[in-house]
């Protein structure tokens, strides 16, 4: 006489909310005589899912006709799956007994896990801007997916990054999971137009990963390079001082002219020119009348960029000895 085997071919069944799930179970022998019942879980707290003989199971239907004498297929279909249906299902053979049937053999179980797509990844950058050569962190979050297995990759301008840490929560069994990953990116001066991308791959996405992006322009501050030039003296003893502020980002920049330490003009950068790399240039001019100067003039240009400490660049305008003589004569 052949020994009874309970065959549950699927170890794992992935089902989306609202779908129907078929739990397969076949037996290899009609003996011993007795019913096959379905349970979720094991031990004394297990939940009865289907009993052909008694009870009311409105969402459960059998795949084949259990009333047929030689039926060996005890598969069931559960309709309108909800997150509460997740768990491991066992088909269990009972031997006919008196006064009660006795459990004879259990199938290996089929785990029903909810198949849920991850939400679109959301990438957020650092709270404050950083300058080139510094490292900034970007965080990517996605939630609501099941099963737990998920793959997350980071890219900068299409090139894969390796410096990141990823966590999937919770660690144990759950109806759905969330993922959080933090990537560290070293900023470069040309990164104003760069982009980081977080890519999430999951069984529910059929090989078409979800992506979230962030622009490095939100995270970078490129400090300006400063250049002061003095145009040759013009008629009427005037000197044109040109102050060039180059390759800065973002565009909020304030410039203050000081003559011998006294503020003579404050400007906020307005008519900027944008470079192809996304940084900006700005030029400011100051016309200084040297005819009424008796001493050398120290011209200082103070640049305050994006709320940072001001950077100073000074230029000494030398007044000729002849002018100094004239000035001192005029004071007598």
């Amino acid at each position: 006489e052949e020994e009874l085997q309970m065959i549950q071919p699927e170890k794992l069944l992935l089902v989306a909310v609202g779908e129907s799930a078929t739990l397969n179970c076949t037996v290899t022998s009609l003996l011993p005589v007795g019913p096959v019942l379905w349970f979720r879980g094991v031990g004394p707290g297990r939940e009865l899912i289907y009993n052909q003989k008694e009870g009311h199971f409105p969402r459960v239907t059998t795949v084949s006709d259990l009333t047929k004498r030689n039926n060996m297929d005890f598969s069931i279909r559960i309709s309108s799956i909800t997150p509460a249906d997740a768990g491991t299902y066992y088909c269990v053979k009972f031997r006919k007994g008196s006064p009660e049937n006795v459990e004879f053999k259990s199938g290996p179980g089929t785990e029903m896990a909810l198949r849920a797509k991850p939400s679109a990844p959301v990438v957020s950058g650092p709270a404050a801007r950083a300058t080139p050569e510094h490292t900034v962190s970007f965080t990517c979050k996605s939630h609501g997916f099941s099963p737990r297995d998920i793959t997350l990759k980071w890219f900068k301008n299409g090139n894969e990054l390796s410096d990141f840490q990823t966590n999937v929560d919770p660690a144990g069994q759950s109806v759905s999971y969330s993922i959080r990953s933090t990537a560290r990116v070293v900023l470069a001066p040309w990164d104003v137009r760069s982009q980081v991308t977080c890519e999430v791959a999951h069984v529910t996405l059929q090989g078409d990963p979800l992506r979230g992006t962030a622009n490095l322009s939100e995270a970078i501050r490129v400090p300006p390079t400063l250049e002061v030039t003095q145009q040759p003296m013009r008629a009427g003893n005037q000197v044109n001082i040109t102050y060039q502020v180059r390759n800065f980002y973002p565009q909020n920049l304030q410039l203050t002219w000081l003559e011998n330490g006294n503020v003579c003009r404050t400007e906020t950068a307005s008519t900027l020119t944008e470079n192809k790399d996304g940084t900006y240039n700005w030029t400011s001019w100051l016309l200084v009348n040297t005819s009424d100067q008796r001493d050398d003039v120290v011209l200082t240009c103070q640049v305050k960029h994006d709320g940072q400490l001001a950077v100073n660049k000074s230029l000494v305008l030398e007044v000729s000895a002849h002018q100094k003589d004239q000035s001192s004569d005029a004071t007598h």
């Epitope: 137009r193 760069s194 982009q195 192809k276 996304g278």
Partner: antibody, heavy 126, light 107 residues
């Protein structure tokens, strides 16, 4: 798939202006710079300038400075190239073309052109 | 402006031939060079970027080499659909400049 579709052929009189459109689809419009290149009949390729559709920033060939203007409409993913004070030597096929990548590298912010429009013939004749 | 000089300006070849086109820049342009194919009445098509990288979808019979000022486009075994005009283009500095073109004709 990436596509750049240009407006139809134009015939203009010397001194007039022409505005050619280039509608982009199949990619993130604001991410990649658009360049304009022209080709006079039987001649080689001449670069006219570039535009950043995100910021509206432009860079033009010195030769055309003051006569060429590039603009964009992000709501329709369209870039426009307007050439004014037309002369007979402006007769050419005008192409819009997308730069291959939308970012800068350590060495350059300029890139080869991987997708091109079908071209727009502009004839300048009195 | 950087001048790009292509040679030859035209050549005749047969199907199966190995064809080489050269391009010289008037100053060093690192590897910032692209090669394009243009057929009559059509827009140019990018074949090679960064001097030696094959653009996606381009047959492997096309290859590029060179750095600095001297560059080469090679078609290892010429096919009927390869008869066209080929242009080199530098993307080292503005203005972007193209070579004068090389017309590959059927012998």
């Amino acid at each position: 798939q990436v596509q750049l579709v240009q407006s139809g052929a134009e015939v203009k009189k010397p001194g007039a202006s022409v505005k050619v459109s280039c509608k982009a689809s199949g990619y993130t419009f604001t991410r990649y710079d658009i360049n304009w290149v022209r080709q006079a009949p039987g001649q080689g390729l001449e670069w006219m300038g570039w535009m950043n559709p995100n910021s509206g920033n432009t860079g033009y060939a010195q030769k055309l400075q003051g006569r060429v203007t590039m603009t964009r409409d992000t709501s329709t993913s369209t870039v426009y190239m307007e050439l004014s004070s037309l002369r007979s030597e402006d007769t050419a096929v005008y192409y819009c073309a997308r730069e291959r990548v939308g970012y800068c590298s350590s060495t350059s912010c300029l890139h080869p052109l991987d997708y091109w429009g079908q071209g727009t013939l502009v004839t300048v004749s009195s | 402006d950087i001048q790009m000089t292509q040679s030859p300006s035209s050549l005749s070849a047969s199907v199966g031939d190995r064809v080489t086109i050269t391009c010289r820049a008037s100053q060093g342009i690192r590897n910032d060079l692209g090669w394009y194919q243009q057929k009559p009445g059509k827009a140019p098509k990018l074949l090679i970027y960064s001097a030696s990288n094959l653009q996606s979808g381009v047959p492997s019979r096309f290859s590029g080499s060179g750095s600095g000022t001297d560059f080469t486009l090679t078609i290892s075994s010429l096919q009927p659909e390869d008869f066209a005009t080929y242009y080199c283009q530098q993307s080292y500095d503005v203005p972007l400049t193209f070579g004068g073109g090389t017309k590959v004709e059927i012998k």
